[in-house]
């Protein structure tokens, strides 16, 4: 639902992390709350403490194992509960049956680097982090370039509709400082969303050669 005054939203990074946000208007800031994960077909269960991120919003990460371990599959269902302390007992505040591969949000791409730069173009590569081998090549990317005098919000989005971990930026201005970001999304999952943007990569195009027509 989307019309309530509270929300319990979780995403799976496709490997060993479920990140959750619980928000509730008028909730007490000093209440101790946690998220409890009970998979339907695993021997483990996991808990994380919800920590405030804003006036009425809490977040936590369920660490299911080593970062690159495949802890859940497409057939898993994890019952997630928000529990808050009320005196001596814990009270369930929210509950959901979580289908991890329907609610994916990958880690931001990493290791951005300039492969080759010229006066008007720049070739950039990156890597995906902690992404499941289940996706094979079923990923897409969005990239954006920050030009001088503009904001990230104004930057046009470049869409790569396949698993392509590089891009060749064209029609750049010589001897100009730019920044570049990329994000990734699996094609799978009804409620899957884009990863966070990568850390920006700063680069400068080469100056135009003196006395030459560019």
């Amino acid at each position: 639902a989307v019309n309530g005054t509270s929300q319990f939203t979780c995403f799976y990074n496709s490997r060993a992390n479920i990140s959750c946000v619980w928000s509730q208007d008028g909730a007490l800031q000093d209440t101790s709350c946690q998220v409890h994960a009970w998979p339907d077909r695993r021997r483990w269960n996991q808990t994380c403490e919800l920590l405030p991120v804003s006036q009425a919003s809490w977040a936590c990460n369920l660490i299911l194992g080593a970062p690159d371990s495949q802890k859940l599959t497409t057939v898993d269902i994890v019952t997630l509960r928000v529990l808050c302390r009320e005196g001596v007992r814990w009270r369930v505040m929210a509950i959901q049956d979580f289908k991890p591969f329907e609610n994916l949000r990958l880690m931001a791409p990493i290791s951005l680097q300039v492969v080759h730069v010229e006066t008007h173009r720049c070739n950039i590569s990156w890597e995906i982090s902690q992404a499941s081998h289940y996706f094979e090549r079923h990923l897409e990317f969005e990239a954006r370039t920050l030009s001088p005098g503009h904001t990230w919000e104004e930057a046009p989005l470049l869409t790569l509709k396949q698993k392509q971990e590089w891009i060749c930026l064209e029609t750049l201005t010589p001897d100009t400082q730019y920044e570049f970001q990329v994000r990734v999304k699996p094609l799978q999952g009804e409620f899957t969303t884009w990863s966070p943007w990568s850390q920006p990569l700063a680069f400068r195009t080469k100056p135009a050669a003196l006395g030459k027509d560019t």
Epitope: A1, V2, N3, G4, T5, S6, Q7, F8, T9, W22, S23, Q24, W38, D40, I77, T79, V82, V92, M93, A94, I95, Q96, D97, F98, K99, E102, N103, E190, F191
Partner: nanobody, 126 residues
């Protein structure tokens, strides 16, 4: 859209049992939260019980714990509320409700739920 239709409400004596049914149709969720609420005259709608569609996890209001049992039949898209040892204070209109995904959160608040049935009247006489 999701349609929810309740049935099974009637007039019974205190101590009797009753089973309410809720039939879901339309765009049903494969992993929704399904709940029963009730509303007595001049009172606010209150949470009774919840079941998660996929795993069958359940939650109950303290006032009905041990007397009421919520269950579901996934194949038939049905949710049931078995009510035993009924008391006069259980008299109310009983509503079936569905939430998510995405989930609003606090399951015992009626404004969490997007979809509601029209209700079925349960009257318990002393």
């Amino acid at each position: 859209q999701v349609q929810l239709v309740e049935s099974g409400g009637e007039l019974v004596q205190g101590g009797a049992s009753l089973r309410l049914s809720c039939a879901a149709s339309g765009r049903t969720f494969s992993n929704a939260n399904m709940a029963w609420f009730r509303q007595a005259p001049e009172k606010e709608r209150e949470f009774v019980a919840l079941i998660t569609w996929s795993s069958g996890s359940t939650l109950y209001a303290d006032s009905v714990k041990g007397r009421f049992t919520i269950s579901r039949d996934n194949a038939r898209k049905m949710v049931y509320l078995q009510m035993n040892s009924l008391k006069p204070e259980d008299t109310a209109v009983y509503y079936c409700a569905a939430d998510g995904p995405p989930y609003s959160g606090t399951y015992y608040r009626y404004d969490t739920y997007d979809y509601w049935g029209q209700g079925t009247q349960v009257t318990v006489s002393s």
